[in-house]
Interface confidence: medium
């Protein structure tokens, strides 16, 4: 009788766009056919997927966050067939460009400023806030009560993922007015917003220069 197969992996926490992952269907069995399923469907052809060693080894050449699985392998011969337990990959990714909410860019003097930052990332990123280039706090939410014109400036949310070793940032320029009237309604609608200001994060320019130059 065929043994129940199992999957071994060379990397259970791969980094998106960086790592390849090799999944091996164990054990080696003579006169058997190896089969693979991803998300409960038979393996479909993809330039990023490579089968080798008589289909016993499945290689994901460059993982993305969509490649978590689950993965199952099976072995079969003319007598019987057996299927492994599912294996899920913990693909680490991000942090993506953060979004600062709410979208307001203009505030009245005396109002409370309550900014929240979110970035898609696995694992969850570390959040930091900088105001006019100065680090203020390491939290996802920035709260300042009773703001004045002294609080004008560039509010940056900086996110860092220790697992991927990657950082990202976004900045919005906020104006505080002493006028009585609230800013007019915009023709744009959203649940959050932010903006980019590259000059604050010198270290990031190294990353940008792979795609851009000054």
């Amino acid at each position: 009788e065929l043994p129940k197969p199992y999957i071994s992996s060379n990397n259970s926490n791969p980094i998106e766009d960086k790592d390849a992952v090799t999944l091996t269907c164990e054990p080696v069995a003579e006169n058997t056919t190896y089969l693979w399923w991803v998300n409960n469907q038979s393996l479909s052809v993809s330039p990023r997927l490579q089968l080798s060693n008589g289909n016993r080894i499945l290689t994901l050449l460059s993982v993305t966050r969509n490649d978590t699985g689950p993965y199952e392998c099976g072995i079969q011969n003319s007598e019987s067939a057996k299927r492994s337990d599912p294996v899920t990959l913990n693909v680490t990714y991000g942090p993506d460009t953060p979004i600062i909410s709410p979208p307001d860019l203009s505030y009245r003097s005396g109002a409370n400023l309550n900014l929240s930052c979110h970035s898609d990332s696995n694992p969850s990123p570390q959040y930091s806030w900088l105001i006019n280039g100065t680090l203020r706090q390491h939290t996802q939410v920035l709260f300042i009560s009773k703001i004045t014109s002294n609080n004008n400036g560039a509010y940056a949310c900086f996110v860092s993922n220790l697992a991927t070793g990657r950082n990202n940032s976004i900045v919005k320029n906020i104006s505080v007015s002493s006028g009585d009237s609230a800013p007019g309604s915009s023709g744009l609608s959203a649940s959050g917003s932010g903006s980019g200001l590259n000059d604050i994060f010198e270290a990031q320019k190294i990353e940008w220069h792979h795609h851009h130059h000054h």
């Epitope: 993305t64 460009t97 560039a154 900045v171």
Partner: antibody, heavy 120, light 108 residues
């Protein structure tokens, strides 16, 4: 090479519907927010909608809110714009565009566009 | 919303000249401005981001400058292939964008 290819445009009567698609290749689609931008016959560019990389966050121009729906299928590397209750002022060339990644949301890649004409 | 105003709809210049296209924001947008070039029948091509950074492959005759509310795209030593329309865009309110109305560059 990054490529964005739009399709689904055409001639439609006021009040009608269309679904635009944008097939992406050459980059990890699921890592990027994506946007739709339109260009009117007068050549004015107007941002229409943006969807975050995972699809959790969605943003619209006020004049299309409730009529247009942006969505994505990361498994198929495809961005969509479902347009309903179309008006003559929606006539435009519709582009899908990719905001850049690191702290710079300027749109670094654009598709070739698909034309939408709303006319009776 | 933030209005981006390109006051000159058309500009005429000669090959070899230097020309400046301007864009004014209705409120402070820091340096969160991009410039795009659009040739007839083509989609917009990114030239400049963060007000002054060129995308790779963009000739160094294209220079962006400005911050706050006033921005300029300067093309030095204008070439015939620079015949195009140029648009500014703010993304201080990302992911909500607004564009300028465009400036069409004509070569004499």
């Amino acid at each position: 090479e990054v490529m964005l290819v739009e399709s689904g445009g055409g001639l439609v009567k006021p009040g009608g519907s269309l679904k635009l698609s944008c097939a992406a290749s050459g980059f990890t689609f699921s890592s990027y927010a994506m946007s739709w931008v339109r260009q009117t016959p007068e050549k004015r560019l107007e941002w229409v909608a943006t969807i975050s990389s995972g699809g959790s966050y969605i943003y619209y121009l006020d004049s299309v809110k409730g009529r247009f729906t942006i969505s994505r299928d990361n498994a198929k590397n495809t961005l969509y714009l479902q347009m309903s209750s179309l008006r003559s002022e929606d006539t435009a060339m519709y582009y899908c565009a990719r905001p850049a990644y690191y702290g710079n949301p300027a749109m670094d890649y654009w598709g070739q566009g698909t034309s939408v004409t709303v006319s009776s | 919303d933030i209005l981006m105003t390109q006051s000159q709809k058309f500009m005429s210049t000669s090959v070899g000249d230097r020309v400046s296209v301007t864009c004014k924001a209705s409120q402070n947008v820091g340096t969160n401005v991009a410039w795009y070039q659009q040739k007839p029948g083509q989609s917009p091509k990114p030239l400049i981001y963060s007000a002054s950074y060129r995308y790779s492959g963009v000739p160094d005759r294209f220079t962006g400058s400005g911050s706050g509310t006033d921005f300029t795209l300067t093309i030095s030593n204008v070439q015939s292939e620079d015949l195009a329309e140029y648009f500014c865009q703010q993304y201080n309110s990302y992911p909500l964008y607004t564009f300028g109305g465009g400036t069409k560059l004509e070569i004499k």
